[in-house]
């Protein structure tokens, strides 16, 4: 392990769509990918008339995007889906939208999935 | 093992429309993104766009902004690539490529624009 | 983003030690470590040997290698063989917030 770095060896995991896709609701996902990369949580949910629906939490390959992130923070000024990514085991369990491109004091959304 | 199978060949007439598909196995689909690159023949490569496979999220090159769209269907674990207003230019082999380095790449798509 | 800059062709004989190089700018190449390194085969697709600058793909010899210095990105074949004729592109991490951009190819002749 490089010292500073979370590695992560596994995600909440979370599917919406679970009956159509044939997976669990809900679990903990271990993390598989080659050896030598680095492998990240996710999170996806939308934001419906400001009620939070997740879509999807599991794990996500290597990407410079999620490098050193330690919180699943989305940045992007109203996406249509939320997404975002954060290393270190079930950093997924909470997720935030931080708008980088925001004038005003941006707002946060921490949620903490509840088991239905 | 990870693969990448694209569908066949095609060949389009100037001014028309071409969708071709990239079908995923051997991972999570929705655990990354799909790239797709094209190459002219004796050309180089070319990056097109890429879509995060769980939020749909998309990012073209500018040159095919407008022309392209990238699309991903999550129940098949297939993504797709349409470009429009097809001209003999867009005569190429199209890829699709696993992931932000592009780590599995499909076998290719030959696209031929002709009259 | 424009493209990368590489030189159209290199050569060297078996054993030999070759180095393609691959320019770009102060807000590309130079600033970040997310350059990549394809080789391929005539009629074949792409194949990722290098990512991150400097880290080899599994399976990939250690004879090829991966630095970078300022705006250029370099990749290195040592010990040459009959079955590294190829083309090389260098390449950008496309996803996210990043767009892609390859080099124009080097085409590598074994001598």
């Known amino acids: 392990a490089i010292l500073g770095r979370s590695e992560t060896q596994e995600c909440l995991f979370f599917n919406a769509n679970w009956e159509r896709d044939r997976t669990n609701q809900t679990g903990v996902e271990p993390c598989y990918g080659d050896k030598d990369k680095r492998r990240h949580c996710f999170a996806t949910w939308k934001n419906i008339s400001g009620s939070i629906e997740i879509v999807k939490q599991g794990c996500w390959l290597d990407d410079i995007n999620c490098y050193d992130r330690t919180d699943c923070i989305e940045k992007k000024d109203s996406p249509e889906v939320y997404f975002c990514c954060c290393e270190g085991n079930m950093c997924n369990e909470k997720f935030s939208y931080f708008p980088e491109m925001e004038v005003t004091q941006p707002t946060s959304n921490p949620v903490t999935p509840k088991p239905p | 093992q990870v693969q990448l199978v694209q569908s066949g060949a095609e060949v389009k007439k100037p001014g028309s429309s071409v969708k071709v598909s990239c079908k995923a196995s051997g991972y999570t689909f929705t655990s990354s993104y799909i790239n797709w690159v094209r190459q002219a023949p004796g050309q180089g490569l070319e990056w097109m766009g890429t879509?995060?496979?769980?939020?749909?999220?998309?990012s073209y090159a500018q040159k095919f902004q407008g022309r392209v769209t990238i699309t991903a269907d999550t129940s098949t674990s297939t993504a797709y690539m349409e470009l429009s207003s097809l001209r003999s230019e867009d005569t190429a082999v199209y890829y699709c490529?696993?992931?932000?380095?592009?780590?599995?790449w499909g076998q290719g798509t030959l696209v031929t624009v002709s009259s | 983003q424009s493209a990368l800059t590489q030189p159209r062709s290199v050569s060297g004989s078996p054993g030999q030690s070759v180095t393609i190089s691959c320019t770009g700018t102060s807000s590309d190449v130079g600033s970040k470590n997310y350059v990549n390194w394809y080789q391929q085969h005539p009629g074949k697709a792409p194949k990722l040997m290098i990512y991150g600058v400097s880290k080899r793909e599994s399976g990939v010899p250690d004879r090829f290698s991966g630095s970078k210095s300022g705006n250029t990105a370099s990749l290195t074949i040592s010990g040459l063989q009959a079955e590294d004729e190829a083309d090389y592109y260098c390449g950008t991490f496309a996803g996210g917030k990043y767009y892609g951009v390859f080099g124009g190819g080097t085409k590598l002749t074994v001598l």
């Open positions: 879509i995060n496979a769980v939020s749909g999220s998309t």
């Open positions: 490529a696993r992931g932000g380095w592009f780590d599995y």
